[in-house]
């Protein structure tokens, strides 16, 4: 029996066999040696490299009573779920005494139906928009030829004749399914079926039609939606005066947007309940039965200024001889813009009214004409922005001032219902 004591006298009495099978196969390679004395550890090589993580078991059977008698050593390497990376030449390696011995080789091969490395994926595409699908398969055996199918209909006359790894689709007008078949000498494997959902194209030309302090009217042009009519469009508006910096293509606004739905047609919508004199960003997407289009880029818009919604507050008017002292506070109601100043009007019972622009001051001293005997003198004040005057206050009568007395304050009891300009008398 071989002892492995002389140079190149192999101790191996059984060498690894050959395994050829399809992916996923489980198999075992086996080698056997007969040695004298302590049995060595058997290592496995694949293509000349020691397998660091080998699923191997070693069995040792003594052929005699003494430790120095012969031993039969069997090593088995288990290959679970055969993959391409498992293929190659396998050998057993032992270090015996001062020598290294390698068994005769066995081979592991892979042969079966094609195996997909890449399959078409589900995706959404805009109507009439080109896109690509990928499919890749390998043997062995090679060659592997691909055949693409759309809605179960082959796109070429035979495998290998049409597009192979990449299928270019110039555009779809309805939701469709795609798959690919991989053909080799062993047969055919069919990939998963990818559903390509056709969504409406992104709307175009989003623009402002008209502006009011609290309303914006916007319009857009719908994109193509294939065979699926648009059911509605959704418009979003978000405040942009806080340095939020929405970029042209930024996907999500940083705060909860104001969302409105528009029936279509017309492709137009009035957005209400907005803040006057405020920058916004708006965008629109349109939806069919298949789903929503992508959003348009954010469009910066701004509501115009309005007039103040209420009169100045806490107006006080006192008279001291030929002088009258009037002061007031800023309106509590929204200004709807930038306050530019105040207008004041005063009038006696039988005298023409006098109109003054006070600017941004909130008090004024009036020089009254004559000896101050004008009776029933009243004062009104209004705030104004670039958009115009707000409502005038109710007339406040001038009261005689007596030293030591607190100045009388006339509260505004009733605000005019309309902000339109009108003289209060």
């Amino acid at each position: 029996a071989p002892r492995g004591t002389q140079a190149e006298e192999s101790p191996f009495v059984g060498n690894p066999g050959n395994i050829t099978g399809a992916r996923g196969l489980t198999g075992t390679l086996r080698c056997q040696l007969q040695v004298q004395g302590e049995p060595p550890e058997v290592h496995w090589l694949r293509d000349g490299q020691i397998l660091e993580l080998a699923d191997s078991t070693q069995t040792q059977v003594p052929l005699g009573e003494d430790e120095q008698d012969d031993w039969i050593v069997v090593s088995q390497l288990r290959i679970t779920s055969l993959q391409l990376s498992d293929t190659g030449q396998y050998q057993c390696l032992v270090f015996l005494g001062h020598q290294t011995f390698v068994s005769q080789p066995g081979y592991v091969g892979l042969e079966g139906l094609p195996y997909f490395l890449e399959e078409p994926e589900d995706r959404t595409v805009a109507a009439n928009t080109p896109f690509n699908l990928s499919c890749q398969a390998q043997g062995p055996p090679e060659p592997v030829d691909l055949l693409w199918l759309q809605d179960a209909v082959p796109l070429a006359t035979a495998p290998g004749h049409g597009p192979q790894r990449s299928l270019h689709v110039p555009g779809l007008n309805k939701t469709s399914s795609f798959s690919c078949e991989a053909h080799n000498a062993k047969g055919v494997t069919t990939s998963r079926t990818a559903t390509i959902t056709v969504l409406p194209q992104q709307p175009r030309n989003l623009h402002l039609v008209s502006r009011q302090p609290t309303e914006l009217e916007v319009a857009w042009t719908p994109g193509l939606s294939g065979i699926y009519p648009l059911t509605h469009c959704t418009l979003q508006a978000v405040l942009s005066d806080d340095g939020m910096g929405i970029q042209a293509g930024e996907p999500d606004p940083p705060e909860e947007p104001l969302t409105s739905q528009a029936s279509v047609p017309p492709h137009q919508l009035r957005l209400g309940s907005l803040h006057p004199h405020t920058p916004y960003h708006i965008r629109v997407a349109c939806t069919s039965s298949q789903g929503p289009s992508s959003w348009t880029h954010w469009l910066p818009v701004e509501t115009p200024e309005g007039v103040p919604l209420g009169p100045p507050e806490n107006i006080s008017a006192t008279r001291n001889g030929s002088q009258a002292f009037v002061h007031w506070q800023e309106p509590r109601a929204p200004l709807q813009g930038t306050l530019l100043g105040y207008r004041l009007a005063y009038q006696g019972q039988d005298t023409p009214e006098v109109l003054m622009d006070i600017g941004l001051r909130q008090e004024v001293t009036l020089e009254l004409q004559g000896d101050g005997s004008v009776s029933n003198l009243t004062v009104c004040v209004a705030a104004y922005t670039a958009a115009g005057d707000g409502p005038w206050s109710l007339p406040v009568p001038l009261e005689a001032w007596r030293p030591g007395q607190a100045q009388p304050v006339h509260q505004l009891v009733k605000e005019p219902s309309t902000p339109a300009f009108s003289w209060p008398w």
Epitope: E8, G48, I50, G88, Q89, L93, V102, P105
Partner: antibody, heavy 118, light 112 residues
Framework: QVQLQQPGAELVKPGASVKLSCKAS????????INWVKQRPGQGLEWIGN????????NYNEKFKSKATLTVDKSSTTAYIQFSSLTSEDSAVYYC???????????WGQGTTLTVSS | DIVMSQSPSSLAVSAGEKVTMSCKSS????????????LAWYQQKPGQSPKLLIY???TRQSGVPDRFTGSGSGTDFTLTISSVQAEDLAVYYC????????FGGGTKLEIK
Amino acid sequence: QVQLQQPGAELVKPGASVKLSCKASGYTFTSYWINWVKQRPGQGLEWIGNIYPDSSSTNYNEKFKSKATLTVDKSSTTAYIQFSSLTSEDSAVYYCTRDTYGGSPDYWGQGTTLTVSS
Amino acid sequence: DIVMSQSPSSLAVSAGEKVTMSCKSSQSLLNSRTRKIYLAWYQQKPGQSPKLLIYWASTRQSGVPDRFTGSGSGTDFTLTISSVQAEDLAVYYCKQSYNLWTFGGGTKLEIK
């Protein structure tokens, strides 16, 4: 009896290419790595690279990647090293050697003396 | 890449003397799977091919006189010739085969 046979000498002109051979016998040629080693006159040993005959898998010393190409012919159990664009720096003795997985026995060819001269 | 450094580059001794030469590797040469140290020593006499003396750091090749001894572990290795003979005139190289191959620069042994 394991043997690695190499021709004794080769004379080539600068700029030319040459293919040196190493004929193996006495063992299963496809089961052991063949290494190639360079030794310039009066200098040390430099490992060039190796090749596994069964799969023709190769490894190279970075220094020789663009200079040397290792191949085998399994049918004749012969390993080859091909050099391109030869210069006088390539004049050396080239040894082929069988690797026994870091152990023993260890086999070396006698070496081929390559002279690059016009 | 693993770098191998040998010292001294040359030494001259009289016959019968003991000689030691050193080889250092830039990383450990111990393979945990096979539990072998992949370090070999070669002797190259003038005009000859290199000849294996020691492998696995300390295992003497069959037929090599027992005056040659290899030792060391990890990254530091030594070749000792206990009593130098005239026929030991040669260059001695260490070689790692833990990851591909790398040779040391060699130690030239001369006899006084």
